[in-house]
Interface confidence: low
């Protein structure tokens, strides 16, 4: 399926609007510090060039690869060296090394100011004045802060962003209409970014075999009536899509994703009865809907797995003849029967099964050796079940904020070398598992909780990779993708850690505390809590609770005072002294 001009091919397939949006996202994800206007200029130049190639595919440079065209364009940025330092050295390389070099310089935690939301009237005026620029700005701002955001999905978010403004800027109460929609888009967007980051980490750090295994398990849960050959085809196609997006090949990725959605909708009968409502929607919405579709009902009377995978005398023969396919079928058969298991647990079971076959198929009596393999699964299943049960009980007892605090203490004691902002961000997100999953029925709790925790812990891993400070974090992040969560769960208090010296400045607060939003106040208090634990890692729960209660009382008192700043100046040192005494 070769084309004379790749850029013309993609322009025709995607259409001008999506083409321009995707090129803007690609450039913004690579050059995260460049001003908006610079990116718009580059995108317009690429688009004009693409149009000349559509008119004549034989025109000069139209036969060049997209990486060559886009890389050449990025390397024309005048301030590359002063803005990005050594990233400018990428431009001295040839493709494909140049693109690999750009990919390696993507920054998961760019030093960009937090996005401030203007007044609703200001946003509506900007939207009406120049809708196209307003939406491009959204794509640019999200893409540069989330360099692995799933590009075709970002176009879907932008379409929803546009729809929200189109509707709400005409409403009687613009703010009441718009703000909840923007909050929802922000929260969903952050979740989508984190989920995609795990897919890219899986592909880049553990290879496409790891991603394919994940996809077999997840798609088998979603489509338990589909046969293995069908699931395998979807997995192959999905792997190609995500490999492309994670590799910066956003045009190919979006094009292939559209093809996959088309295939799924044309073959609903052999995939799932749940696809119908997705398939009537327009492209971006359809692809999103298919990705989020609920699990189909399990076929009735599925026979026991034991017959083919334990009792059969041919297990070792089948395994030897086609290891990955046989293990893939095992994973498919297990996953379609267990929508109540997390994908990560299913992958652990497949790994355990593989390890047993590796050992037993070399034994004198293989059948006797692997006869009890399913019994060995029990502890692997019970571990996440118990973890979810215990943590949901704790969440129900404490509520979200205090549950987050419990996790902050737990994780700071495990890995106190990690930076305080990272510990706060990750623990706050770990704590959100309660509200997200604990309200669900028993059968949905584990897949919700453990697969969400995998996404959050991946964020810890990518941030830690940028500035490694803890051997324990490196070990948990790199040894096994499927065992990351159990690895972190198993970490104990780091006995080798030398407590941080007490710094009064860290615990000095001012009247600006009083004007912060509730969320910002929580972050301030949680930052102080992490610092306390770093100072006194062996402090008991009761000691830390006492200090935090005093802190809340001190802030509340000063925020009610007439002269707030004077109160903070007077009461602050008293709080610090009392805290030190309480933790002595």
């Amino acid at each position: 399926d070769t084309h004379k001009s790749e850029v013309a091919h993609r322009f025709k397939d995607l259409g001008e609007e999506h083409f321009k949006g995707l090129v803007l996202v690609a450039f913004s994800q690579y050059l995260q510090q460049c001003p908006f206007e610079e990116h718009v200029k580059l995108v317009n130049e690429v688009t004009e060039f693409a149009k000349t190639c559509v008119a004549d595919e034989s025109a000069e440079n139209c036969d060049k690869s997209l990486h060559t065209l886009f890389g050449d364009k990025l390397c024309t940025v005048a301030t590359l060296r002063e803005t990005y330092g050594e990233m400018a050295d990428c431009c001295a390389k040839q493709e494909p090394e140049r693109n690999e070099c750009f990919l390696q310089h993507k920054d998961d935690n760019p030093n960009l100011p937090p996005l401030v939301r203007p007044e609703v009237d200001v946003m509506c005026t900007a939207f009406h004045d120049n809708e196209a620029t307003f939406l491009k700005k959204y794509l640019y701002e999200v893409a540069r802060r989330h360099p692995y955001f799933y590009a075709p999905e970002l176009l879907f978010f932008a379409a929803r962003y546009k729809a929200a403004f189109a509707e709400c800027c005409q409403a009687a109460d613009k703010a009441a209409c718009l703000l909840p929609k923007l909050d929802e888009l922000r929260d969903e967007g952050k979740a989508s970014s984190a989920k995609q980051r795990l897919k890219c980490a899986s592909l880049q750090k553990f290879g496409d075999r790891a991603f394919k295994a994940w996809a077999v398990a997840r798609l088998s849960q979603k489509f338990p009536k589909a046969e293995f050959a069908e699931v395998s085809k979807l997995v192959t196609d999905l792997t190609k899509v995500h490999t492309e997006c994670c590799h910066g090949d956003l045009l190919e990725c979006a094009d292939d994703r559209a093809d996959l959605a088309k295939y799924m909708c044309e073959n609903q009968d052999s995939i799932s009865s749940k696809l119908k409502e997705c398939c009537d929607k327009p492209l971006l919405e359809k692809s999103h809907c298919l990705a989020e579709v609920e699990n189909d009902e399990m076929p009735a009377d599925l026979p026991s797995l034991a017959a083919d995978y334990v009792e059969s005398k041919d297990v070792c023969k089948n395994y030897a003849e086609a290891k990955d396919v046989f293990l893939g079928m095992f994973l498919y058969e297990y996953a379609r029967r267990h929508p109540d298991y997390s994908v990560m647990l299913l992958l652990r079971l497949a790994k355990a099964y593989e390890a047993t076959l590796e050992k037993c198929c070399a034994a004198a009596d293989p059948h006797e050796c692997y006869a009890k393999v399913f019994d060995e699964f029990q502890p692997l299943v019970e571990e996440p079940q118990n973890l979810v049960k215990q943590n949901c009980e704790l969440f129900e007892q404490l509520g979200e904020y205090k549950f987050q605090n419990a996790l902050l203490v737990r994780y700071t004691k495990k890995v106190p070398q990690v930076s305080t902002p990272t510990l706060v961000e990750v623990s706050r997100n770990l704590g959100k598992v309660g509200a997200k999953c604990c309200k669900l029925p028993e059968a949905k709790r584990m897949p919700c909780a453990e697969d969400y925790l995998s996404v959050v812990l991946n964020r810890l891993c990518v941030l830690h990779e940028k500035t490694p400070v803890s051997e324990k974090v490196t070990k948990c992040c790199t040894e096994s993708l499927v065992n990351r969560r159990p690895c972190f769960s198993a970490l104990e208090l780091d006995e080798a850690y030398v407590p941080k010296a007490f710094n009064a400045e860290t615990f000095t607060f001012h009247a600006d505390m009083c004007t912060l939003s509730e969320k910002e106040k929580q972050v301030k208090k949680q930052t102080a809590l992490v610092e306390l634990v770093k100072h006194k890692p062996k402090a008991t729960k009761e000691q830390l609770k006492g200090v935090m209660d005093n802190f809340a009382a001190f802030v509340e008192k000063c925020c009610k005072a007439d002269d707030k700043e004077a109160c903070f100046a007077e009461e602050g040192p008293k709080f610090v002294a009392a805290s030190q005494a309480a933790l002595a």
Epitope: K225, A226, E227, F228, A229, E230, D269, S270, P299, L302, P303, A307, D308, E311, S312, K313, D314, K317, N318, E321, A322, V325, F326, M329, Y332, E333
Partner: nanobody, 115 residues
Framework: QVQLVESGGGLVQPGGSLRLSCAAS????????MSWVRQAPGKGPEWVSA????????RYAESVKGRFTISRDNAKKTLYLQMNSLKPEDTAVYYC????????GSQGTQVTVSS
């Protein structure tokens, strides 16, 4: 690309016999258990019979036990279903699947039992 092509269906009187074949390609046929599944008009798929990769272990749904026989020829990459003492309630589209799936991934072959 995995392909399964069934043949051998047709119209037969009650009590009669038919032999269905399923030709496989695109995967290591000899490494996988296989099943026959059927779908009667207006009904969901029903698992009929399964055979392990080597052909030694066979299993049947209660409704066909003693009347149907599943077999395979790994050299020819073909799965068979010998159907004897056919009844009107055996009327359905029959299709073969890899493993124990009851999802229809191929066209199937129509079997009609009627006098």
């Amino acid at each position: 690309q995995v392909q399964l092509v069934e043949s051998g269906g047709g119209l037969v009187q009650p009590g009669g016999s038919l032999r269905l074949s399923c030709a496989a390609s695109g995967f290591t046929f000899g490494s996988f258990g296989m099943s026959w599944v059927r779908q009667a008009p207006g009904k969901g798929p029903e698992w009929v019979s399964a055979i392990d990769s080597g052909g030694a272990d066979t299993r049947y749904a209660e409704s066909v036990k003693g009347r149907f026989t599943i077999s395979r020829d790994n050299a020819k990459k073909t799965l068979y279903l010998q159907m004897n003492s056919l009844k009107p309630e055996d009327t359905a589209v029959y299709y073969c699947t890899i493993g124990q799936s009851t999802s229809r991934g191929s066209q199937g072959t129509q079997v009609t039992v009627s006098s």
